[in-house]
């Protein structure tokens, strides 16, 4: 069907809606996908949990924003904030960033299309 | 080598309607975002519209939005933009251009520019 | 009045440095990619930068494009007198749902 788009809503809204929800089971599965269980990550303990729940618990999580599709780009962005600051080298910024990048399509979402997730300045 | 060229400006009345196109050559058309952008004399860049691969997507200017309508030829290799209800500041160069844009993870970005079309808006 | 915030003009001497900057806020610049584009007197805009920092085949390295928070810069070293020309910046606005261009900087080499 053709659609022609207006106007998606405002960002400060979407950055409301990120506010409210639970972004924690988002960053341990990612965390989990590319740390493994490797006993260095152990500032949430990722191993009590599967990372098939974790999955589910972060697109529940992400499914209770109103606007879940509009959002996503913000949700993405505040989940690569957050962990910014534990990523140890270049090389786990681009594995976490990979996998971030994943997760709208694990969750059954459309991926973003214009988002940039490089949100830190240059700190990841 | 990758050519645009845009057709169709000329002088209107305000109030008047001109359909500009624009013949694009040497990459596969169909593959790629289109955009109108334009130039007032003397004036910045103002994008204008975007229009997705399949014309299934449209984006507009505020102030062209129910005056201006994008649509592409993918087997004429053609974009076209049919401007009614014409204002004198609607007067600017109009380019076509070719969008990078992806379905994911990137930006708009116009890479490759016509050589612009004059439309003059005047009584 | 553009929604981002370019100088009107830069000037610098033949094989220095310059930058320009585009100030912008967190549904444009903040959330999405910057590019940037030379315009030569009398002819149509020419792509430098995309994606905040990537530069297109052709486009020598003495350009540059970063981006920080809400604001993006074009750095330019070994400035020439071809450089002379005017620099735009663009992105995506989320809430205008729409792409938009900075003023325009005029870049004039002393």
């Known amino acids: 069907m053709r659609r022609e788009r207006g106007r998606q809503g405002d960002s400060s809204s979407c950055e409301r809606q990120v506010d409210r929800v639970n972004l924690k089971p988002c960053e341990q599965h990612i965390m989990q996908r590319i740390m493994g269980e490797q006993e260095q990550y152990d500032s949430y303990d990722i191993r009590s949990t599967r990372s098939s729940d974790q999955q589910q618990r972060c697109c529940d999580e992400l499914n209770e924003m109103e606007n879940t599709q509009r959002c996503m780009c913000e949700a993405l962005q505040q989940i690569m904030e957050n962990q910014c600051d534990r990523l140890q080298d270049r090389q786990m910024v681009q594995q976490f960033k990979r996998e971030l990048m994943n997760l709208p399509q694990q969750c059954n979402f459309r991926a973003p299309q214009r988002c940039d997730l490089d949100v830190s300045g240059g700190r990841c | 080598e990758v050519q645009l060229v845009e057709s169709g400006g000329g002088l209107v009345q305000p109030g008047g309607s001109l359909r500009l196109s624009c013949a694009a050559s040497?990459?596969?058309?169909?593959?790629?975002?289109m955009t109108w952008v334009r130039q007032a004399p003397g004036k910045g860049l103002e994008w204008v519209a975007n229009i997705k691969q399949d014309g299934s997507e449209k984006d507009y200017l505020d102030s062209v939005r129910g005056r201006f309508t994008i649509s592409r030829d993918n087997a004429k290799n053609s974009l076209y933009l049919q401007m009614n209800s014409l204002r004198a500041e609607d007067t600017a160069v109009y380019y076509c251009?070719?969008?990078?844009?992806?379905?994911?993870?990137?930006?708009?970005?116009?890479?490759?520019w016509g050589q612009g079309t004059l439309v003059t808006v005047s009584s | 009045q553009s929604v981002l915030t370019q100088p009107p003009s830069v000037s610098a001497a033949p094989g220095q440095k310059v930058t320009i900057s585009c100030s912008g806020t967190g549904s444009n610049i903040g959330h999405n990619y910057v590019s940037w584009y030379q315009q030569l007197p009398g002819t149509a805009p020419k792509l430098l930068i995309y994606?905040?920092?990537k530069r297109p085949s052709g486009i020598p390295d003495r350009f540059s494009g970063s981006k920080s928070g809400t604001s993006a810069t074009l750095g330019i070293t070994g400035l020439q007198t071809g450089d002379e020309a005017d620099y735009y910046c663009?992105?995506?606005?989320?809430?205008?749902?729409?792409?938009?261009f900075g003023g325009g900087t005029k870049l004039t080499v002393l």
């Open positions: 663009a992105t995506w606005d989320a809430d205008l749902s729409a792409v938009l």
């Open positions: 251009t070719r969008n990078g844009l992806q379905d994911s993870y990137s930006g708009d970005f116009f890479d490759h």
């Open positions: 994606d905040n920092t």
């Open positions: 040497g990459f596969k058309f169909s593959t790629f975002y």
